[in-house]
């Protein structure tokens, strides 16, 4: 049974130029998590590996940071990093759970960031 | 290379306890599930449980919740089943196996060990 | 409980492609039943093969395959060699346990 949840930042702003922090959280099951994947729509954007540790797709090379935690770290924001992000955990027994994160980048100097969620 | 080693066999006498034990090498031992699965002689394989090994928090099958207990010490990467009030049903090779959750299952097995109970 | 059906035994000629299958009691498998192919051979240690329906283990030669097929899941060994006559096991996860099937015994000859 597949008891987890995920929490995520949810939807959140940044300005365009800036940097964000994507975090997820896996809760509510006793599933031990063996990998975590970050996607950008259908685009791989980096794996956290149990075994292997962190692997940034090379065309995120740049702008892409691992961490912290199980998080990603997204900078140089530009407005075609607007939309939806997904953290997709694989876990034993359980099997795969996704979070999803709307990201807002804005032209504006006005943009409210959402608030920094940390993995305890 | 990701090896399992499990303690020797054991002649153990009905109502005694038997903790065996399985030691995890190749790998980081807090990163992956530890399952445990018997075959009794002439009988197929049936999963007892696993144990999360970062948290420490076993989950046992309805059929072997009470007398078999699953524990850890992660200073030396090893797995431990402890069966108490043992009986002679409870002769069978006992293995230990990885539980990986990419691609979900169990990926890397103990040799096993055997367990006769025997007045 | 669930009840996990194999074929007692197979025959496969070497260079040949056999299909083992693992069906449930309770109606079709699904990817939901994380399908598990593990082979043993006499004196040896479980050696996994396929977890989560089709990911192949780590080693595990390419001629190896798993897949759903027919409400089942199937192991396809394409190419049979001599060294892949052993017994061979799945298992399948209902919701909070896994239960294996009774095995297949594959021959090659």
């Known amino acids: 049974m597949m008891t987890g949840t995920i929490e995520t930042t949810g939807n959140i702003s940044a300005e365009k130029g800036g940097s964000i922090i994507l975090q997820c959280h896996l809760s509510s099951t006793t599933a031990q998590v063996t990998q975590v994947n970050w996607e950008q729509q259908d685009q791989l954007l980096a794996i956290c590996n149990a075994d292997l540790g962190w692997h940034i797709s090379p065309s995120f090379k740049d702008r892409v940071a691992p961490g912290p935690g199980l998080g990603l770290t997204l900078q140089s924001l530009t407005v075609n990093d607007t939309g939806e992000y997904f953290c997709i955990y694989h876990t034993y027994p359980d099997g795969t759970y996704t979070g999803r994160i709307f990201l807002e980048v804005l032209e504006s100097s006005v943009a409210e960031h959402g608030a920094r969620f940390q993995i305890p | 290379q990701v090896q399992l080693v499990q303690s020797g066999a054991e002649v153990k006498k009905p109502g005694a306890s038997v903790k065996i034990s399985c030691k995890a090498s190749?790998?980081?031992?807090?990163?992956?599930?530890m399952n445990w699965v018997r075959q009794a002689p002439g009988q197929g394989l049936e999963w007892m449980g696993w144990i999360n090994t970062y948290t420490g928090e076993p989950t046992y099958a309805q059929k072997f919740q009470g007398r078999f207990t699953f524990t850890l010490d992660t200073s030396t990467s090893t797995a431990y089943l402890e069966i108490s009030s043992l009986r002679s049903e409870d002769t069978a090779v006992y293995y230990c196996?990885?539980?990986?959750?990419?691609?979900?299952?169990?990926?890397?097995w103990g040799q096993g060990t055997l367990v006769t109970v025997s007045s | 409980q669930a009840v996990v059906t194999q074929e007692p035994s197979l025959t496969v000629s070497p260079g040949g492609t056999v299909t083992l299958t693992c069906g449930s009691s309770?109606?079709?498998?699904?990817?939901?039943?994380?399908a598990n192919w593990v082979q043993q051979k006499p004196g040896q240690a479980f050696r996994g093969l396929i977890r989560?329906?089709?990911g192949r283990g780590s080693g595990v030669p390419a001629r190896f395959s798993g897949s759903l097929l027919g409400g089942k899941a199937a192991l396809t060994i394409s190419g049979a060699q001599p060294e892949d006559e052993a017994e061979y096991y799945c298992?399948?996860?209902?919701?909070?346990?896994?239960?294996f099937g009774g095995g297949t015994k594959l021959t090659v000859l």
């Open positions: 196996s990885r539980g990986n959750g990419y691609y979900v299952g169990m990926d890397y």
């Open positions: 989560g329906t089709n």
């Open positions: 298992a399948l996860w209902f919701s909070n346990h896994w239960v």
């Open positions: 190749g790998y980081t031992f807090t990163n992956y599930g």
């Open positions: 309770t109606g079709a498998v699904t990817t939901s039943n994380h």
